[in-house]
C-alpha cells in the first residue's frame, strides 16, 4: 500500500493576513486565525513529518480584501509560490479582472500548474493562453505519480468576467475524456480538483470513471468528523464518501473558506491505484499555530502599499451620501441606492441576446450601511471612507429566489417598522409600496420588479411563481437580520465580490456620483 497526504485549501478570497474568527479583519491578534504565514507553518510541519504530500488549492484565491484590490493577483502568485503549492484549479473569481487579469499576474507567474478541463479557449485567445493552464497534470510524489484533473463552475460567465473567448463546458462531460487519457498513461491515482460546489463535487465522484478523490470548492462547505473546533457547522463527515456508479467508494472533501482551515486527507492506495482507506479532518489554523517569521515579514513588506492605497481618492460625490441609520433603517436612502446601483453594475453580463442583463434586482439590509459620507470634504471618497460604510468585509452574492420568497422578504423588511432595526431593505431594480396601517405580514401593497428579458427595461408586477435572480449581501443569503426565508428557500447561491471593492470600482468608473432618493420605496398615503 502507498499513502498520500492531501493538504487543501479553497475559497481563500484574498485572506493573506490572519483574520478574526469570522474571517473579517483581525482585531485581537491572540485570537486570530488563518493567513498564509500560519498556513505555511502547518504545511511545513506536515511536509517534514510525512513522505508523500500534495498541497492543492481548489480555486477562488482572487477577490475578497484590499489585497486583491491593490495587487490584482500578483499577491496570490507570490505567496502561493512561497508556500510551494503543487497545483491549483481555476475558480470563477479568478476571472474577475478579465482573462488578462488572470494571465499576467497569475498564470504567467505561478510556479505550479493551474488546471481546468472544462474551460476551452477559442479565437485569438487560444494561442495566447495555450499551455498557461492545463486540463490536467501528472505530478511525481515520492516514487509514484498522481494525476490531477481540474474543473471550474460552468456558471462562471454569469458570476465573473471571462469574456467571449472562453467556453465553459459541462464538468462531467469534459472531465471523463481527460481522466481516460490519464489512464492511457498508466496513471492510476487520480484527483479531481475543482471549483463547482459540493453538489457537483459529489456528482463528479459518482459519475466520472477513474476519479479516486474529489477536492472541491465554491460552496464553502465545511465537513468534519467528530466535534468541530470552531463556529462552523459541518455539512457532513470528512471525508464525505460517495459510492460511484461503478461501485467504488470515493472520498469528497472541501475545507470551508478564507484560509481558516487546512484540509488534511490521508489516502491509502493499493498497488493498482484503488483507494483502500481515507481519513482526516480540516485543521483549524488558530493562534496555537505560530505564524512563520519569514512569510510574516514578507506580508508586512507587501502591506505597506495597502496602507497608502486606502487614503487615495477613488472618485467624488457632489451630494451628501446619507448612510445614517435614521434614514437607511426607515426609508429609501441615497447611500442604499448607490450601493445597489454598484451591485447591479458589477453584475452586468450580456450572455444572452434575449436579456439586457441576467439580473436586475438588488436588496440590501439598511442595517448593513454603517456610515454616511459628507460631500463637504472636497467631495473626496476614499477606500477608508467606504470601509466605514461597509466595515464587515462581506460579499455581494447572486441568488435565485421565487417571487413568493421575495414577497416574504419585503414583508419581513417592515414587520416591526419604526424600531430602527436593520432589516429594512434598500433596493435597486425594485419599486415597493408599503402600507403600515395594515398588520405585519400584509404590508406590501405593491411590488414591481425590473424586467431582464426585455430590450427596454420596465417595471412589472412581481410574479409569485417566477424565479428571479437577485444580488444581495452574503449576510442576507445566510439568513441574517431574520431573513430566514431567503436562506431556507433560495434555489441557488453563488458568492460574489467583496462589498467595498464593488462600490469602489463603481465610484472609480463613474468618477463623479450624485445618487438621489427617487421613489424606489414608497409608503401609501396616510400610513407614514
Amino acid at each position: 500500500a502507498w499513502e498520500l497526504t492531501i493538504l487543501h485549501t479553497n475559497d481563500v478570497h484574498s485572506r493573506l493576513e490572519q483574520t478574526s474568527e469570522d474571517s473579517s479583519k483581525c482585531v485581537n491578534a491572540s485570537r486570530c486565525m488563518g493567513g498564509v504565514a500560519r498556513l505555511f507553518t502547518k504545511v511545513q510541519q506536515i511536509r517534514r513529518a510525512e513522505p508523500n504530500v500534495l498541497l492543492l488549492d481548489a480555486g477562488d484565491q482572487y477577490q475578497g480584501t484590499i489585497w486583491f484590490t491593490v495587487y490584482k493577483g500578483a499577491e496570490v502568485a507570490h505567496f502561493m509560490n512561497a508556500l510551494r503549492y503543487d497545483a491549483m484549479a481555476l475558480g470563477n473569481h479568478e476571472f474577475d479582472n478579465g482573462v488578462e487579469g488572470l494571465i499576467e499576474p497569475l498564470l504567467k507567474e505561478a510556479k505550479f500548474p493551474i488546471l481546468s478541463a472544462n474551460i476551452k479557449a477559442k479565437g485569438p485567445l487560444a494561442s495566447q493562453i495555450s499551455g498557461l493552464y492545463l486540463p490536467y497534470k501528472v505530478l511525481p510524489v515520492g516514487d509514484e505519480v498522481v494525476g490531477i484533473v481540474g474543473y471550474t463552475s460552468k456558471e462562471t460567465p454569469f458570476l465573473s468576467n471571462p469574456g467571449t473567448n472562453l467556453v465553459f463546458e459541462d464538468e462531467i462531460t469534459a472531465l471523463q475524456p481527460e481522466v481516460d487519457k490519464l489512464k492511457t498513461l498508466n496513471v492510476n491515482k487520480i484527483i479531481a480538483l475543482g471549483h463547482s460546489g459540493f453538489e457537483m463535487d459529489k456528482l463528479i465522484a459518482q459519475k466520472v470513471r477513474g476519479v479516486d478523490v474529489v477536492v472541491g470548492g465554491h460552496s464553502n462547505t465545511f465537513l468534519y468528523t467528530g466535534n468541530p473546533p470552531s463556529k462552523e457547522v459541518p455539512a457532513g463527515k470528512y471525508p464525505f464518501i460517495v459510492t460511484s456508479d461503478d461501485g467504488r467508494k470515493v472520498p469528497v472533501v472541501q475545507a470551508y473558506a478564507f484560509g481558516k482551515y487546512l484540509g488534511y486527507l490521508k489516502i491509502e492506495f493499493d498497488e493498482r491505484g484503488n483507494v483502500i482507506s481515507s481519513h482526516g479532518n480540516p485543521i483549524l489554523l488558530n493562534s496555537s499555530i505560530p505564524e512563520d517569521p519569514s512569510i510574516k515579514a514578507d506580508i508586512n513588506k507587501w502591506r505597506i502599499k495597502l496602507d497608502n492605497y486606502s487614503t487615495q481618492e477613488l472618485g467624488k460625490t457632489i451630494v451628501y451620501l446619507d448612510g445614517s441609520s435614521q434614514s437607511c433603517r426607515f426609508r429609501e436612502c441615497n447611500m442604499g441606492n448607490l450601493i445597489c446601483d454598484a451591485m447591479i453594475n458589477n453584475n452586468l453580463r450580456h450572455t444572452d441576446e434575449m436579456f439586457w442583463n441576467h439580473v436586475s434586482m438588488c436588496i440590501l439590509n439598511g442595517g448593513g450601511i454603517r456610515s454616511p459620507i459628507d460631500e463637504r470634504n472636497n467631495g473626496t471618497i476614499t477606500w477608508e471612507n467606504l470601509a466605514a460604510v461597509l466595515p464587515f468585509g462581506g460579499t455581494f452574492d447572486l441568488v435565485q429566489l421565487k417571487g413568493s420568497t421575495l414577497k416574504k422578504a419585503f414583508e419581513h423588511s417592515v414587520h416591526r417598522y419604526g424600531q430602527s432595526t436593520g432589516e429594512f431593505l434598500q433596493v435597486g431594480g425594485i419599486h415597493v409600496v408599503y402600507d403600515l396601517s395594515r398588520k405585519p405580514g400584509d404590508r406590501v401593497v405593491k411590488l414591481d420588479v425590473l424586467c431582464t428579458k426585455c430590450r427596454v427595461p420596465s417595471y412589472d408586477p412581481l410574479k409569485m411563481d417566477e424565479v428571479y435572480k437577485v444580488i444581495l449581501p452574503n449576510f442576507l443569503a445566510n439568513g441574517g437580520d431574520g431573513f430566514q426565508m431567503i436562506k431556507d428557500e433560495l434555489l441557488r447561491h453563488d458568492s460574489g465580490d467583496q462589498d467595498i471593492n464593488v462600490v469602489s470600482t463603481y465610484i472609480s468608473k463613474m468618477k463623479v456620483i450624485y445618487p438621489a432618493v427617487e421613489g424606489r420605496i414608497k409608503f401609501s398615503t396616510g400610513s407614514h
Partner: antibody, heavy 121, light 107 residues
Framework: QVQLQESGPGLVKPSETLSLTCTVS????????WSWIRQPPGKGLEWIGY???????NYNPSLKSRVTISVDTSKNQFSLKLSSVTAADTAVYYC???????????????WGQGTLVTVSS | DIQMTQSPSSVSASVGDRVTITCRAS??????LAWYQQKPGKAPKLLIY???SLQSGVPSRFSGSGSGTDFTLTISSLQPEDFATYYC?????????FGGGTKVEIK
C-alpha cells in the same frame, strides 16, 4: 520566451564523470519537467531522464545506474552527471523542457542548442 | 521499452511534392506521439504533438494523424526549408523513445 543553454566540458576521459548544466532563462523552473536527451554523431535521439522542477527524477533504465539529474531552483539550473563514461557516450547532449501543453513530460519544447561531449583519452 | 520504427529511412522529393512519413509503435500508445524536425547542427524542433496537434508557429502544411500503433506525418507541399530529418517520439510510457529518423532530401 524560455531559453535553455547547456554548458560543461567538451572533452571527458574514459571512466570519468561527464557533468553538464542547463541554465533556464525567461521562465520558472519549478512547474515543468526538464529532460536530458543525447544524440551520438550521425545517429538518432536517446532520452536520458527527467527531473521535475521540485526535484523528482526518472531515468532511462539503460543508463539508470550511471545517471544523476539534479536541480537548483535558486539558480534556475538543472544538471546531468553521467559516470564511468566510455567512447559510446560521445554525443551531442541536449537539455529540453516538456512542451507547455504536455501533462507529463510527453514531448519536448524548447530545446537547448546542444553541446558536443567527446569521450577520449 | 516501446520501439518506434520509422519508414522510409530517407526520401527524395521535389519542392511542391506531398511527402508522407510513417511511424509504427511496438505497442499501443493511444495518441501520445510527437513529430520533430531536425536540421544539421541544430536541435530538434517540435512540429506535431498528441499525434495531430500543430505546435504554435508551425506552418499548416504539416499535419499528423493516427492513433494506437500507426502514425503519419504529412507535408502537403514541400518547401525548400523543409529538407531535414524528421523523428517521431512516443510520450506514452517511460523511457521516452524516438524513431530512427527519416531524412527528406532534394531530388
Amino acid at each position: 520566451q524560455v531559453q535553455l543553454q547547456e554548458s560543461g566540458p567538451g572533452l571527458v576521459k574514459p571512466s570519468e564523470t561527464l557533468s553538464l548544466t542547463c541554465t533556464v532563462s525567461g521562465g520558472s523552473i519549478e512547474r515543468y519537467y526538464w529532460s536530458w536527451i543525447r544524440q551520438p554523431p550521425g545517429k538518432g535521439l536517446e532520452w536520458i531522464g527527467y527531473i521535475y522542477g521540485r526535484g523528482s527524477t526518472n531515468y532511462n533504465p539503460s543508463l539508470k545506474s550511471r545517471v544523476t539529474i539534479s536541480v537548483d531552483t535558486s539558480k534556475n539550473q538543472f544538471s546531468l552527471k553521467l559516470s564511468s563514461v566510455t567512447a559510446a557516450d560521445t554525443a551531442v547532449y541536449y537539455c529540453a523542457r516538456e512542451s507547455q501543453e504536455s501533462p507529463y513530460n510527453n514531448w519536448f519544447d524548447p530545446w537547448g542548442q546542444g553541446t558536443l561531449v567527446t569521450v577520449s583519452s | 521499452d516501446i520501439q518506434m520504427t520509422q519508414s522510409p529511412s530517407s526520401v527524395s522529393a521535389s519542392v511542391g511534392d506531398r511527402v508522407t512519413i510513417t511511424c509504427r509503435a511496438s505497442q499501443g500508445i493511444s495518441s501520445w506521439l510527437a513529430w520533430y524536425q531536425q536540421k544539421p547542427g541544430k536541435a530538434p524542433k517540435l512540429l506535431i504533438y498528441a499525434a495531430s496537434s500543430l505546435q504554435s508557429g508551425v506552418p499548416s502544411r504539416f499535419s499528423g494523424s493516427g492513433s494506437g500503433t500507426d502514425f503519419t506525418l504529412t507535408i502537403s507541399s514541400l518547401q525548400p526549408e523543409d529538407f531535414a530529418t524528421y523523428y517521431c517520439q512516443q510520450g506514452n510510457s517511460f523511457p521516452r523513445t524516438f524513431g530512427g529518423g527519416t531524412k527528406v532530401e532534394i531530388k
